[in-house]
């Protein structure tokens, strides 16, 4: 059976690329190296994905299980208010923000944190799974 999915056989499961983790209905990539926010965004976009946009508290709680004290970039920025890269506002959680110059969002096991965008951090990409290529 596919972990975290409703599919009954592996052959019919949409799959994730190598080094991506399937969780629920999405694929997640947790980086090993560190980059600034913009470079992290570019990395995700180049792989037909986006910097992690969290849809609700449930998804956030599930993902935090895989995180440590180390912060990871996510698709969250402060442009006259904290917004996800899909344009939606941050409304299900609060972000720890201390300074006007900290305009990019990161996550660790304890929650969301604002940071200066050029700090090199790990990052998380998110994408939809694709159907098993062998089926086509």
């Amino acid at each position: 059976l596919c972990q975290g999915s409703n599919y009954s056989t592996c052959a019919s499961c949409p799959s994730c690329p190598d080094r991506w983790m399937k969780y629920g209905n999405h694929c997640y990539y947790f980086s090993v190296e560190e980059k600034d926010w913009n470079s992290s965004l570019e990395f995700c976009l180049a792989r037909d994905s986006h910097l992690l946009v969290i849809t609700d508290n449930q998804e956030m709680s599930l993902l935090q299980v895989f995180l440590s004290e180390a912060f990871c970039w996510i698709g969250l920025r402060n442009n006259s208010g904290w917004r996800w890269e899909d344009g939606s506002p941050l409304n299900f959680s609060r972000i720890s923000s201390n300074s006007f110059v900290q305009t990019c969002g990161a996550i660790n096991k304890n929650g969301l944190q604002a940071s200066s965008c050029e700090v090199p951090l790990h990052w998380v990409c998110k994408k939809c799974p694709f159907a098993d290529q062998a089926l086509f």
Partner: antibody, heavy 125, light 112 residues
Amino acid sequence: QVTLKESGPGLVKPTQTLTLTCTFSGFSLSTFGMGVGWIRQPPGKALEWLAHIWWDDDKWYELALKSRLTISKDSSKNQVVLTMTNMDPVDTATYYCARVIYYGSRSAYYSMDYWGPGTTVTVSS
Amino acid sequence: DILMTQSPLSLPVTPGEPASISCKSSQSIVHSNGHTYLEWYLQKPGQSPRLLIYKVSNRFSGVPDRFSGSGSGTDFTLKISRVEAEDVGVYYCFQGSHVPVTFGAGTKLELK
């Protein structure tokens, strides 16, 4: 609201050790990306960076003064302490503490976005 | 150490008129990450310095839009479009791109 306030002895004798305390509020020095630094300004002269300490206790000092300086923090009390040994009349200055925002380098490139009012230190016998 | 040279050292300005302060670094202060960590601070009489501009051209919170920063490489400028009485004080440029971080000697802005 972020505030910082320096306190110190005001007058120290040559060769003595200066101890300065920066008490702050409105942020936590346990939070990722936060630091507190010390800057001084001799009378009628320009500003000079001395030292700073980061949220994870990483410390950085002005190279020429490194042997005389010690910076430490007590996050629970929201305080940072700077000690400077072997004080000399040329160390007479206004000493400021400032909040420092991390940009990815421990040693450089940061913003000092909030400053304390300063404390005047005179070194004289 | 990188020397930050400000000019002029004294700047008398008529209220309502523009003002411009130059800051030149002895070598490029473009960091290897592509960012330029050049900041401007204002120290009003009897007060501590406060951050006006960070990363060359970004106004800090609460700074009026009559203040603007520009420049690249080694040449930087702070402009005030219309000087007001509350703008009087000493303006310092600061480079944080390379260790040790260094301040300019300051430019004293006063009213004519």
